[in-house]
Amino acid sequence: MKVLQEPTCVSDYMSISTCEWKMNGPTNCSTELRLLYQLVFLLSEAHTCIPENNGGAGCVCHLLMDDVVSADNYTLDLWAGQQLLWKGSFKPSEHVKPRAPGNLTVHTNVSDTLLLTWSNPYPPDNYLYNHLTYAVNIWSENDPADFRIYNVTYLEPSLRIAASTLKSGISYRARVRAWAQCYNTTWSEWSPSTKWHNSYREPFEQH
C-alpha cells in the first residue's frame, strides 16, 4: 500500500482542517488508514482522524482543532496499521479556505432595489470575521448567458442592485462565496443558492 498523491490540507481557520490524498489503488480508508496530527507545542496531545473514502483510491479526513492562530504548526503522520506511509507538516494559516457564507436572502420589497443579505460564517472573535470579502453570483434560470458576478469588497455582508439591471418577469438565482486577502485564502465554497422572481415597474415612457 502506497500513497500516490500526498495529503494536501486546508483549514477553515476555526475548528476544522480537511486533508485529502490518493492511494495507489482502491482502499477502504476508514478501516485501513489513520491520520495522526499533533500541534507542534511542548506536551501537546496527538489526535487521530479516521478518514473517509473520496472516490475509489481517494481519502479525506476532517481534523478537529480547538481553534487556530497564525503561529500554529501541525505534524501529520499517515499510518496503515503499524506502517508509516507518509510524514508531513501543515500550517493552517498558510492554507485557509474560509467557510461558506450562509442565510442568503433576497429582499425584493425595497422599492425597485434588490437587497441581498447573507451571514458572515465566523463569530466576531475569529480573526477572519473582519477580513472577509465576497463575490455574489446571480444568474437566470432561463438564460445561461445571463450570468454575472458582483464583487463585494466592503465588510458588510450585503449587496444592493437595481432590479432593472436584471430582466423583469423571470426567475433568478443567487449564491455567495467568501475569501480573505490577509491570509491569501482560496475562495470558500458557494453558499446554497436562493431563488426569486424578478419583477419591477418599467418606467413610464413619455413620447
Epitope: L39, L42, L43, S44, E45, H47, A71, D72
Partner: antibody, heavy 118, light 107 residues
Framework: EVQLVESGGGLVQPGGSLKLSCAAS????????MHWVRQASGKGLEWVGH??????????YYADSVKDRFTISRDDSKNTAYLQMNSLKTEDTAVYYC?????????WGQGTTVTVSS | AIRMTQSPFSLSASVGDRVTITCKAS??????VAWYQQKPAKAPKLFIY???TRHTGVPSRFSGSGSGTDYTLTISSLQPEDFATYYC?????????FGGGTKVEIK
C-alpha cells in the same frame, strides 16, 4: 465556556494526605493534558505536575519538590483530574490550581487552599 | 531545570504609561515563553505564548517579543485594569518554570 473547578482543599497535619479534584466542563476533556500549579501566600507560581491524555498513555511529569509524594490521575468518563498528596509538609501549604494545557496553560480553575499545619 | 529571571520585581506607573517587563532564561528557549496576568485573590490568566502570540481576547496594547534567552512583555498604554502581577513561563521543556513575577502598581 471552558470551566475548571477545584475542590478537596483543607487543613491537614504534616505527614497527612489529601486528594484534590478538578472538574472540567465546556471542552472535550479527554483530548487535553492537565496541569497542577500551586502558589504559596504572597509568593510566585510553582508548577506541580502534569498528566497527558490517553493518546500519550496518560504519562505524568512532576516537579522534583513533590516527586514520590504526589500523584496525578484522571478519569475521562467523569471529566475530572486528581492530585493525590501524601506525606504532606508545611511547605506544601498553598493555593492549588488545575489548568488545561493546549498552547500553554490556557484556562485555570479558581484554586483550592491546602494548609499543612499541626 | 531552566531558570526564568524576571525584572523588575515591582514597578509603579500611571495610566497611559508604556510599561516593559523583562524575563531572562538560563538557556535558549527558542521563543517558547508565555506570559500570565494575575490579579489579587484571582487565578492567573494566559496572555501571551510563543513569545509574541496573544491569547484569545487579550487587548492589542499587550505585546510580547524576544528570542534566545531574552524576552519582553510590553503594555503600550497602561489602563486601570492592567494593574496586576505578571509572570513569564518557559514552555520549552519540563519541568515547566515560572519567573518570580512583576507587580505593576499605581503610581
Amino acid at each position: 465556556e471552558v470551566q475548571l473547578v477545584e475542590s478537596g482543599g483543607g487543613l491537614v497535619q504534616p505527614g497527612g494526605s489529601l486528594k484534590l479534584s478538578c472538574a472540567a466542563s465546556g471542552f472535550t476533556f479527554s483530548m487535553y493534558g492537565m496541569h497542577w500549579v500551586r502558589q504559596a501566600s504572597g509568593k510566585g507560581l510553582e508548577w506541580v505536575g502534569h498528566i497527558r491524555s490517553k493518546s500519550s498513555n496518560y504519562a505524568t511529569y512532576y516537579a522534583d519538590s513533590v516527586k514520590d509524594r504526589f500523584t496525578i490521575s484522571r478519569d475521562d468518563s467523569k471529566n475530572t483530574a486528581y492530585l493525590q498528596m501524601n506525606s504532606l509538609k508545611t511547605e506544601d501549604t498553598a493555593v492549588y490550581y488545575c489548568t488545561r494545557w493546549f498552547r500553554a496553560m490556557d484556562y485555570w480553575g479558581q484554586g483550592t487552599t491546602v494548609t499543612v499545619s499541626s | 531545570a531552566i531558570r526564568m529571571t524576571q525584572s523588575p520585581f515591582s514597578l509603579s506607573a500611571s495610566v497611559g504609561d508604556r510599561v516593559t517587563i523583562t524575563c531572562k532564561a538560563s538557556q535558549d528557549v527558542s521563543t517558547a515563553v508565555a506570559w500570565y496576568q494575575q490579579k489579587p485573590a484571582k487565578a492567573p490568566k494566559l496572555f501571551i505564548y510563543w513569545a509574541s502570540t496573544r491569547h484569545t481576547g487579550v487587548p492589542s496594547r499587550f505585546s510580547g517579543s524576544g528570542s534566545g534567552t531574552d524576552y519582553t512583555l510590553t503594555i503600550s498604554s497602561l489602563q486601570p485594569e492592567d494593574f496586576a502581577t505578571y509572570y513569564c513561563q518557559q514552555h520549552y521543556s519540563t519541568p515547566l518554570t515560572f519567573g518570580g513575577g512583576t507587580k505593576v502598581e499605581i503610581k
